[in-house]
Amino acid sequence: HSDGIFTDSYSRYRKQMAVKKYLAAVLGKRYKQRVKNK
């Protein structure tokens, strides 16, 4: 259900957590790549 139709507050919380975790992983990967390239 990646379209995020659900409005249940627990589902909303889990979606927020998932996005946070994903962004942290992506940003962390980019940071590591930048350090490596230096």
Epitope: H1, D8, S9
Partner: antibody, heavy 120, light 110 residues
């Protein structure tokens, strides 16, 4: 692992607190849930506590039960106004991780359960 | 309210046969469904999540299918060890809901 404790025989109206003790993972990383099962019956969801200590409950709970974290490794289920209908095995279960394309919740790791008997 | 209805409540199967269990959601839950196996005196064990993904260590004889409101658990090549009660569970909502679990299906192996 997940282990429940505190189940015993109580009389109607007596409050009771069950404890779920986890090991091998952190409560700061996983949401936890309580589920119960009356003798010979199906599974019944009670509620969930997340890593931020926010809680969600089944509609039937109506404030009688409260889930809280009491330490970095324990989750309590406080039960009040108990009736014979609350006689059940109470399970503590770890909730699945959330992912961007799958943020549904599932019960991935269960304890053996603790039996609560409410009888006069 | 979102209600999960499981059928049949009990089913009998011969060793080597196939068992089909159905789960109906009262509203669209996309693929947010899990299946659990519970043997007497034991806690439930997660078999399948995201409607069709096998949990770690689960035999490929178990197959989950469906999406939206209709879901199926199929057990092929039934073994004596498959005798248990099976539950479906919607994973779409947990706030002020009735029960995310279906009523259960008892599988008896002959």
């Amino acid at each position: 692992s997940v282990e429940e404790s505190g189940g015993r025989l109580v009389t109607p109206g007596t409050p009771l607190t069950l404890t779920c003790t986890v090991s091998g993972f952190s409560l700061s990383s996983y949401d936890m849930s309580w589920v119960r099962q009356a003798p010979g019956k199906g599974l019944e969801y009670i509620g969930i506590i997340n890593t931020n200590d926010d809680t969600w409950y089944a509609s039937w709970v109506k404030g009688r039960f409260t889930i809280s974290k009491t330490s970095s490794t324990t989750v309590d289920l406080k039960m009040t106004s108990l009736t014979t209908e609350d006689t059940a095995t109470y399970f503590c279960a770890r909730i699945s991780d959330a992912y961007v394309f799958d943020y549904a919740y599932y019960f991935t790791l269960w304890g053996q359960g603790t039996l609560v008997t409410v009888s006069s | 309210a979102l209600v999960m209805t499981q059928t049949p409540s009990s089913v009998s199967a011969a060793v080597g046969g196939t068992v089909t269990i159905n789960c109906l959601a009262s509203q669209n839950i996309y693929n947010s469904l899990a299946w659990y196996q519970q043997k007497p005196g034991q806690p439930p064990k997660l078999l399948i999540y995201r409607a069709s993904t096998l949990a770690s260590g689960v035999s490929s004889r178990f197959k989950g299918s469906g999406s939206g409101t209709q879901f199926t658990l199929t057990i092929s090549g039934v073994e004596c060890a498959d005798a248990a009660t099976y539950y479906c569970q919607q994973g779409a909502g947990a706030d002020n809901i009735g029960n995310p679990f279906g009523g259960g299906t008892e599988v008896v192996v002959k």
